[in-house]
C-alpha cells in the first residue's frame, strides 16, 4: 500500500485515504505517550495509569495483593500506592525491620539485639535486668 508522510503538514497517505497525524493535539495525561491512529490517537500509559487517555488510576492494591509485606496495609493513591506498616516494620513495602537498637537504652557495655518491634539487651557478666542496669546479685 502506498504510504507517504509529508512532514510539513503531518499528512499520511494510506492507500487512497488521507490520514492526519493527530498527536500534535494530543491530550494524553499523567505521563502518557501519544501514538497516532487513523483519524484519532491513543495513549501509551505508564504502569500506574490506565484508560484511553491515562486518566484512570491503576489500583495496585488490587493487582498486587502482596504489595505490602509483614502485615502492612495497602492504600491506593492517584498515580501509585502506599503501605501503612505495622509496628516494627518500615520502608515502601514494609520489608525493612526498624532498628529498635537505634533508640534502645541498654546500659553501656551491654549488647543490643534488634527484634521485630522490640529489642533485648545481652548483659555483660555482673549485670542483669532488661536494660542490664542492675548489678547481678549472683555475682556480688
Amino acid at each position: 500500500a502506498h504510504h507517504h508522510h509529508h512532514h510539513g503538514e503531518n499528512l499520511y497517505f494510506q492507500g487512497s485515504e488521507r490520514n492526519i497525524d493527530d498527536c500534535p493535539n494530543h491530550r494524553c495525561q499523567n505521563g502518557g505517550v501519544c501514538v497516532d491512529g487513523v483519524n484519532t490517537y491513543n495513549c501509551r500509559c505508564p504502569p500506574q495509569w490506565t484508560g484511553q487517555f491515562c486518566t484512570e488510576d491503576v489500583d495496585e492494591c488490587l493487582l498486587q495483593p502482596n504489595a505490602c509485606q509483614n502485615g502492612g496495609t495497602c492504600a491506593n493513591r492517584n498515580g501509585g500506592y502506599g503501605c501503612v506498616c505495622v509496628n516494627g516494620w518500615s520502608g515502601d513495602d514494609c520489608s525493612e525491620n526498624i532498628d529498635d537498637c537505634a533508640f534502645a537504652s541498654c546500659t553501656p557495655g551491654s549488647t543490643c539485639i534488634d527484634r521485630v518491634a522490640s529489642f533485648s539487651c545481652m548483659c555483660p557478666e555482673g549485670k542483669a535486668g532488661l536494660l542490664c542496669h542492675l548489678d547481678d546479685a549472683g555475682n556480688s
Epitope: 493527530d22 500534535p24 493535539n25 494530543h26 491530550r27 494524553c28 495525561q29 499523567n30 505521563g31 502518557g32 505517550v33 490517537y41 505508564p46 484511553q52 487517555f53 486518566t55 492517584n78
Partner: antibody, heavy 120, light 107 residues
Framework: EVQLVESGGGLVQPGGSLKLSCAVS????????MEWVRQASGKGLEWVAA??????????VYSASVKDRFTISRDDSKSTLYLQMNSLKTEDTAVYYC???????????WGQGTLVTVSS | DIQMTQSPSSVSASVGDRVTITCQTS??????LAWYQQKPGKSPKLLIY???RLQDGVPSRFSGSGSGTDYTLTISSLQPEDFATYYC?????????FGGGTKVEIK
Amino acid sequence: EVQLVESGGGLVQPGGSLKLSCAVSGFTFSDFYMEWVRQASGKGLEWVAAQRNKANDFSIVYSASVKDRFTISRDDSKSTLYLQMNSLKTEDTAVYYCSRDGGRLALDAWGQGTLVTVSS
Amino acid sequence: DIQMTQSPSSVSASVGDRVTITCQTSEDIYSGLAWYQQKPGKSPKLLIYGASRLQDGVPSRFSGSGSGTDYTLTISSLQPEDFATYYCQQGFKYPLTFGGGTKVEIK
C-alpha cells in the same frame, strides 16, 4: 492547598506588549499541563494556549487566534507560568485565567484572573 | 476544531427544580467532557470531569452523563447557590473548546 495567582494585566495600546505571570503552589508544577484561558466581558470562555508537562517535554499548543503573537512558557524553579503577549489587538481585551490541567482532561484549578485591556 | 453546541443559553428555574443542560460536540470526544460553574466576577469551578465523574467537594445533586457526541449536566434539586452560568468543555484534543454557556436564573 493548590493555588494559582495571576499578575501582569493592565492597559496597553494596540500593537503593544504585555507579560502575564501565574505563580503556583501546592503541587509539583512540572507534573501538570498548564493552560491559559480568557474571557471577554459578558462573553464565554476561550482557550488560549497550553504547555504540557515534563513527561511530554513541555510541548506547547496555541489557539489559531494568538499563534505567532503569544508565547507561553514556564520557570519550574519559580513555579511560575508566563504568557508573553505581543502585537496586541483590541479583541484580546479580556480577563486572562491561568489553570491547571488536573490529569483528568479537565481544568481543576483556576487563578483569580487578571484583566488585560487593549485600547488607544 | 471541535465545535461545542450548548443548550439552552439560559433557563429560568425555582429552588427545588430539576435543571438539565445539554452539550453536543461536532465529533466523538470519548467522554472527555467537563462541566464548570461560574458566578459573576469569579473564576470557573470544575464540577464534572470524564462526562460523569463528580469533582471532589461538589454536591451530589450535580450529575453528568453521556458519551460519543451527546452530554448532559443535571442539577437534581436547584439550590440558591446554584444560580450561575454553566459551561461544557471538551478535553479530547487541542484546541480545547467550550460551549457558549447556560445562565441559570431565578424564576
